[in-house]
């Protein structure tokens, strides 16, 4: 079995987590997506799920989870907005593509939030950003019940992430307001 | 097929200004990130800017910030780059590029020359 | 910013020989890593992206492997098509660094 690998982000409160998960465009494009968080001792949860069929470029939000899929690049964009130190933990993407189990997009996140000023750039972001709006109108998408809690047996590919403290225009709910509903029949 | 066209490169003097266009057909503009990515005569490629298809992020190399403008016109599908201040060290082949992370089509670039 | 490096600048391999490039970042970029192929007088295009993922039409002779801050970039049998320039590039994080380029050629 392929080891299973950590990228540890240390943020403040306040901040982005901006985390690109590569796929193969031409396996993956329409499949959907989700982003879970893996708590010790127990399974994956889904906090936040692309729809099904995942669209184009059309972001999904979930409280302060945003979900980009990129068909034409083969890239699934998780942001975090307004992070907190409660979200802490370890994260992953993953593609569900039923009746198999959920399919590893890359090395997980090890997010780790702490309490601070977050008005300046994040450890991982310098000057370079100049404009960052959250989108005003983004759907919320249904996610599988399901997660799995295999070991990984393929090469797991790929993501990273990125931080920045975004100029938000609108109030995000907590991540943990979701309803969990299946959506396979 | 994904085709990108650059316009508008030419010759200016320093402290000069240009404003380079890209004609995007073959995909959905209005979907996809978009970049300008440049390269000095004999040199390495060198990213300038990326903004997202709704222009609610715009990102900027340090060196061009506040003198260069990436903007975009969904309903035309055309990308732009008002060039401000210009310098001899701007002097380079500009690309247009599909894609606002890595780069997936590139146009054949528009040479723009910064002499006096 | 990450600095990406990228070594040897010139290899000389024969055709139908393995070559092997490498680019190292100096911090971790996960695997967001890609890799470009640019012909004298031609614009750039992308031959690998997540460090090991071929693009579309990318034939299988093409790899990439590496993560965190080792990469490297394979061409089993060089074919006359594959001399040319390639860069890696980052894009972990703002701004978007690529590395300074190996020219392959003919030995």
């Known amino acids: 079995a392929t080891k299973l690998t950590e990228e540890k982000y240390e943020l403040k409160e306040g901040q982005t987590l901006d985390v690109k998960c590569d796929y193969t465009l031409e396996k993956f494009a329409s499949s959907q997506k989700a982003w879970q968080i893996i708590r010790d001792g127990e399974m994956p949860k889904t906090l936040a799920c692309t729809e099904r069929p995942s669209k184009n470029s059309h972001p999904v939000q979930v409280g302060r989870i945003i979900l980009e899929d990129y068909h034409d690049h083969g890239l699934l964009r998780v942001r975090m907005v307004n992070l907190q130190v409660e979200d802490s933990g370890l994260y992953q993407c993953v593609i569900y593509q039923p009746p198999k189990e959920p399919h590893m997009l890359f090395d997980r996140i090890r997010l780790v939030v702490t309490k601070g000023f977050s008005g300046t750039p994040g450890s991982n972001e310098n000057s370079t950003q100049n404009v960052y709006k959250i989108p005003p109108t983004t759907t919320k998408a249904l996610c599988p019940l399901y997660t799995s809690p295999r070991t990984v047996t393929q090469a797991p590919p790929k993501s990273t992430a990125d931080v920045s403290t975004p100029d938000s225009e609108i109030n995000l709910t907590n991540v943990t307001d979701i309803i969990r509903v299946p959506v396979f029949n | 097929e994904v085709q990108l066209v650059e316009s508008g490169g030419g010759l200016v003097q320093p402290g000069g200004s240009l404003r380079l266009s890209c004609a995007a057909s073959?995909?959905?503009?209005?979907?996809?990130?978009m970049s300008w990515v440049r390269q000095a005569p004999g040199k390495g490629l060198d990213w300038m800017a990326s903004?997202?298809?709704?222009?609610?992020?715009?990102y900027y190399v340090d060196s061009v910030k506040g003198r260069f403008t990436i903007s975009r016109d969904n309903a035309k599908n055309s990308l732009h780059l008002q060039m401000n201040s210009l310098r001899a060290e701007d002097t380079a082949v500009y690309y247009c590029?599909?894609?606002?992370?890595?780069?997936?089509?590139w146009g054949q670039g528009a040479l723009v020359t910064v002499s006096s | 910013e990450i600095v990406m490096t990228q070594s040897p600048a010139t290899l000389s391999v024969s055709p139908g020989e393995r070559a092997t490039l490498s680019c190292r970042a100096s911090q971790s970029v996960s695997s967001n890593l890609a890799w470009y192929q640019q012909k004298s007088g031609q614009a750039p295009r992308l031959l690998i992206y997540?460090?090991?993922i071929r693009a579309t039409g990318i034939p299988a002779r093409v790899s990439g492997s590496g993560s965190g801050t080792e990469f490297t970039f394979t061409i089993s049998s060089l074919q006359s098509e594959d001399f040319a320039v390639y860069y890696c590039?980052?894009?972990?994080?703002?701004?978007?660094?690529l590395g300074g380029g190996t020219k392959v050629e003919i030995k």
């Open positions: 073959g995909f959905t503009f209005s979907s996809n990130w």
């Open positions: 590039q980052q894009y972990k994080n703002w701004p978007l660094t």
């Open positions: 903004m997202k298809q709704d222009g609610s992020e715009i």
């Open positions: 997540g460090a090991s």
């Open positions: 590029v599909r894609g606002g992370w890595r780069f997936e089509s």
